[in-house]
Interface confidence: low
């Protein structure tokens, strides 16, 4: 009778992560009697995957009933495959021995390759906000994919970006890989509503790439422009001065009126109007009683935006032409919607 051969018909098997791998193995003879075992890898460091005789292997099922005396099919199924399961699997026939079974013959091995989808790309922007015209870096990371070949693209509002660098790690063989890319984006004043998109294409995605996004609203700071104007006189000896705070983002903004360098009122912008580009406008006004001033008044609108150093715009109010009203000591009346007390 011909000597038993262990046949592994598949040189390689490709399985998607999460699926079940079938590793085929047959023997050409029932003799000698003895169990089979499956190993990953060869040599002294090989890893036991399945032992027909003993042990608990919850992820492994046999294709046929190995307890049948005439069974020569030793194929197994390994469930819930992950990239860590990649490797070469050997079906090994043992013959009965005393006290231990003795390895008799091994199959040629089947290489299991795992196709693992990349994780959803995570896009992260700079830790601190930046202003228009500045270049900021965005990173995109995706992990756990196999095989190594992968394509990554960057877009801003649908337009493909070209200024980026991408690395796939590790460089050598691995069960799975990671990709890391850094793109440089120049901010514009219109970017509050903009999005940066990182798109990853991989063989496992069947033409439907994964995308990660970052909203530039979390990255951009659009500093306000200030305009201080004197409105027509509302009443005798009273002048209404407005400070238009335009095109700022984010909303957190604090405005202080100063009269000749002295703080008159501080407000926080809470009721703002939103522009089409996502920036905000706000207006504060000050009613100045000119009769309380003997000299010209320098009115300053000072704005602290998003924790940045204050910017200001001043307006010189000429009071010499106005008649003095005796007994008045109120220099400014608080007409703003948001009051802040100071001093």
């Amino acid at each position: 009778e011909e000597e038993l051969q262990v046949i592994q018909p598949d040189k390689s098997v490709l399985v998607a992560a999460g699926e079940t791998a079938t590793l085929r193995c047959t023997a050409t003879s029932l003799i000698p009697v003895g169990p089979i075992q499956w190993f990953r890898g060869a040599g002294p460091g090989r890893e036991l995957i399945y032992n027909q005789k003993e042990g608990h292997f919850p992820r492994v099922t046999t294709v046929s009933d190995l307890t049948k005396r005439n069974n020569m099919d030793f194929s197994i199924r390994i469930g819930n495959i992950t990239p860590a399961d990649a490797g070469t699997y050997y079906c090994v026939k043992f013959r009965k021995g005393s006290p231990d079974d003795v390895e008799f013959k091994s199959g040629a091995g089947t290489e299991l390759s795992v196709r693992a989808k990349p994780s959803a790309p995570v896009v992260s922007g700079p830790a601190a906000r930046a202003t228009p015209q500045h270049t900021v870096s965005f990173t995109c990371e995706s992990h756990g994919f196999s095989p190594r070949d992968i394509t990554l693209k960057w877009f801003k509002n649908g337009n493909e970006l070209s200024d980026f660098q991408t690395n796939v790690d590790p460089v050598g063989e691995s069960v799975s890989y990671s990709i890391h890319s850094t793109a440089k984006v120049v901010l514009t004043r219109e970017d509050v509503h903009s999005q940066v998109i990182c798109e990853v294409a991989h063989v496992t995605l069947q033409g439907d790439p994964l995308r990660g996004t970052a909203n530039l609203s979390e990255t951009i700071r659009v500093p306000p422009t200030l305009e201080v104007t004197q409105q027509p006189v509302r009443a005798e000896n009273q002048v209404n001065v407005t400070c238009q705070v335009r095109k700022f983002y984010p909303q957190r903004l604090q405005l202080t009126w100063l009269e000749n360098g002295n703080v008159s009122r501080t407000e926080t912008a809470s009721t703002v109007t939103e522009n089409k580009d996502g920036t905000y406008n706000w207006m504060s006004w000050l009613l100045v009683n000119v009769s309380a001033h003997r000299d010209d008044v320098k009115l300053t609108c000072q704005v602290e935006h998003d924790g940045q150093p204050a910017v200001s715009k001043s307006h010189d109010l000429k009071v010499s032409a106005h008649p003095k009203e005796q007994g008045s000591n109120t220099a400014a009346e608080n007409t703003g919607s948001n009051e802040r007390n100071i001093y």
């Epitope: 957190r252 501080t266 407000e267 926080t268 809470s270 009051e339």
Partner: antibody
């Protein structure tokens, strides 16, 4: 770790003065706005005063305006509250507290001291 | 000044109960609202900032919501260690103002 320790409380007669101190450690004191908040016995919390990191912005509650003065010494990592013309209604536990974000105020109070008791009574 | 009206002023609930506290501002304060916990004899502790953000290290059973004038603070499953007084605080304008507090007790 971040810590605030108040001191200077005590018993004082109406019309008298006290100076509270708050020693800060574990963070860059000069970068953070600071607050004083008080709590009368059995009552709720009442904000008293705030000072920005560089002294440029100071705020007071109407109830203490003109009587209390907040100040800070960034070199000594210390916050102060000078209380003059004290009244019975100023009796409270006084807490100092720091802002969560550096160089900016209006986010709240993320670290508090243990409080120091001020009693105004004749 | 912006008034903060907190309700109820006190409540008693069983361990595991869902507890809800409301806070109403006298004018629009956007999301500039914080929630604090104060245990007897202790300093207040920041739990929620900007209406709905959980401060680092605070258990996830605490949550906050709301914007404008109406805000809600929730303890999804009351624990014995949650016995305390809870305060809302507006930071939209100076003077900073607190709600009157809600004392939470265990039945």
């Amino acid at each position: 770790q971040v810590q605030l320790v108040e001191s200077g409380g005590g018993l004082v007669k109406p019309g008298g003065s006290l100076r509270l101190s708050c020693a800060a450690s574990g963070f860059t004191f000069s970068s953070y706005s600071m607050h004083w908040v008080r709590q009368a016995p059995g009552k709720g919390l009442e904000w008293v005063s705030s000072i920005s990191s560089s002294d440029s912005w100071i705020y007071y509650a109407d109830s203490v305006k003109g009587r209390f003065t907040i100040s800070r010494d960034n070199a000594k990592n210390s916050l102060y509250l000078q209380m003059n013309s004290l009244r019975a209604e100023d009796t409270a536990v006084y807490y100092c507290a720091k802002e969560p974000r550096s160089y900016w105020h209006g986010y709240g109070m993320d670290v508090w001291g243990q409080g120091t008791t001020v009693t105004v009574s004749s | 000044d912006i008034q903060m009206t907190q309700s109820p002023s006190s409540l008693s609930a069983s361990v595991g109960d869902r507890v809800t506290i409301t806070c109403q501002a006298s004018q629009d304060i956007s999301n500039y609202l914080n929630w604090y916990q104060q245990k007897p004899g202790k300093a207040p502790k920041l739990l929620i900032y900007d209406a709905s953000n959980l401060e680092t290290g605070v258990p996830s059973r605490f949550s906050g919501s709301g914007s404008g004038t109406d805000f809600t603070f929730t303890i999804s499953s009351l624990q014995p260690e949650d016995i305390a007084t809870y305060y809302c605080q507006q930071l939209s304008n100076y003077p900073i103002t607190f709600g009157g507090g809600t004392k939470v007790e265990i039945k």
